[in-house]
Amino acid sequence: MAPTSSSTKKTQLQLEHLLLDLQMILNGINNYKNPKLTRMLTFKFYMPKKATELKHLQCLEEELKPLEEVLNLAQSKNFHLRPRDLISNINVIVLELKGSETTFMCEYADETATIVEFLNRWITFSQSIISTLT
């Protein structure tokens, strides 16, 4: 089925939502004053070999559990990330965006990345896809 303007708009909105969530996480943790940042950086994430299409979001989906584990370290009285809710929201968006019709086997790069590099990669991906839709 050819994409309609309404389905394109929906995809764009979902990507913008995903982008905002990823940026919020990054801004919340990538602060030189964050007392847990150095320890959060010891966690390693798998990066996609290729991320140019919505189906490649499978690679993000597979890393959401490790992401939640690291985000559990990021809470403070004045910064309520609520990792479980946030990851659940991201998961819903990712599932809708990548679709469940085709099963895509994610291919990962050899080198692992820090949480900051990982988030930046998926932020760049989201921005890139949004730019092709607008």
Epitope: R39, F43, K44, L73, N78
Partner: antibody
């Protein structure tokens, strides 16, 4: 019971190499970071560095960078602290400890019993 | 690195005494509403034992006679009624900034 058990006391000569261990039990070893702390005779505590046993990622106190190497083998729930060339000034008690950092805190909740390292010619 | 200065460095006290140990940081150890200051007890030949975390939270299994308070740069560990098993050295530790640092210790001896 959650515990960290360290290897026994060591007596070494200057220039020799050494690797001491810290074995975790009673909990999921890869779910918690392991820290190393030095206590020189009659002195206070100094943080040396940390390892994530799940990923192997490390972070060192600048003071100890290049002086020691921290590693881990998650298959046997063990973290290590090693020296390639010991000095007399490395004589101290070395502790491993488990880092807790979920929620609103960051502290060492479980400690090993310590490993005494004596370096003397 | 953040310097932690404990006072006094040592003192003598009797069983039943109320004991207060202070720890002053060279800069604030607060972050987004939390004070990253912990207290440990160490007995001769033994490993340190956690007493208080995040300035005022009592570790599970630690007697309620121990309490912690403070924020910013000034912190206090209080033992409301000293018991014989409390004679030991006490260390404060900041976990707000790497490298984590410890105070020089306060040795509590029997009078």
């Amino acid at each position: 019971e959650v515990q960290l058990v360290q290897s026994g006391a060591e007596v070494k000569k200057p220039g020799e190499s050494l690797k001491i261990s810290c074995k975790g039990s009673g909990y999921a070893f890869t779910n918690y970071l392991i820290e190393w702390v030095r206590q020189m005779p009659g002195k206070g505590l100094e943080w040396m560095g940390v390892i994530n046993p799940g990923s192997g990622g490390t972070y060192y106190n600048e003071k100890f960078k290049g002086q020691v190497t921290i590693s881990a083998d998650k298959s046997i729930s063990t973290a290590y602290l090693q020296w390639s060339s010991l000095k007399a000034s490395d004589t101290a008690m070395y502790y491993c400890a488990r880092w807790r950092g979920e929620g609103y805190y960051a502290y060492f909740d479980v400690w090993g019993q310590g490993t005494t390292v004596t370096v003397s010619s | 690195a953040i310097r932690l200065t404990q006072s006094p460095s040592s003192f003598s006290a009797s069983t039943g005494d109320r004991v207060t140990i202070t720890c002053k940081a060279s800069q604030s150890v607060d972050y987004q509403g939390d004070s990253y200051m912990n207290w440990y007890q160490q007995k001769p030949g033994k490993a340190p034992k956690l007493l208080i975390y995040t300035a005022s939270n009592l570790e599970s299994g630690v007697p309620s006679r121990f309490s912690g308070s403070g924020s910013g740069t000034d912190f206090t560990l209080t033992i409301s009624s000293l018991q014989s098993e409390d004679f030991a050295t006490y260390y404060c530790q900041q976990s707000n900034e790497d490298p984590y640092t410890f105070g020089g210790g306060t040795k509590v001896e029997i009078k």
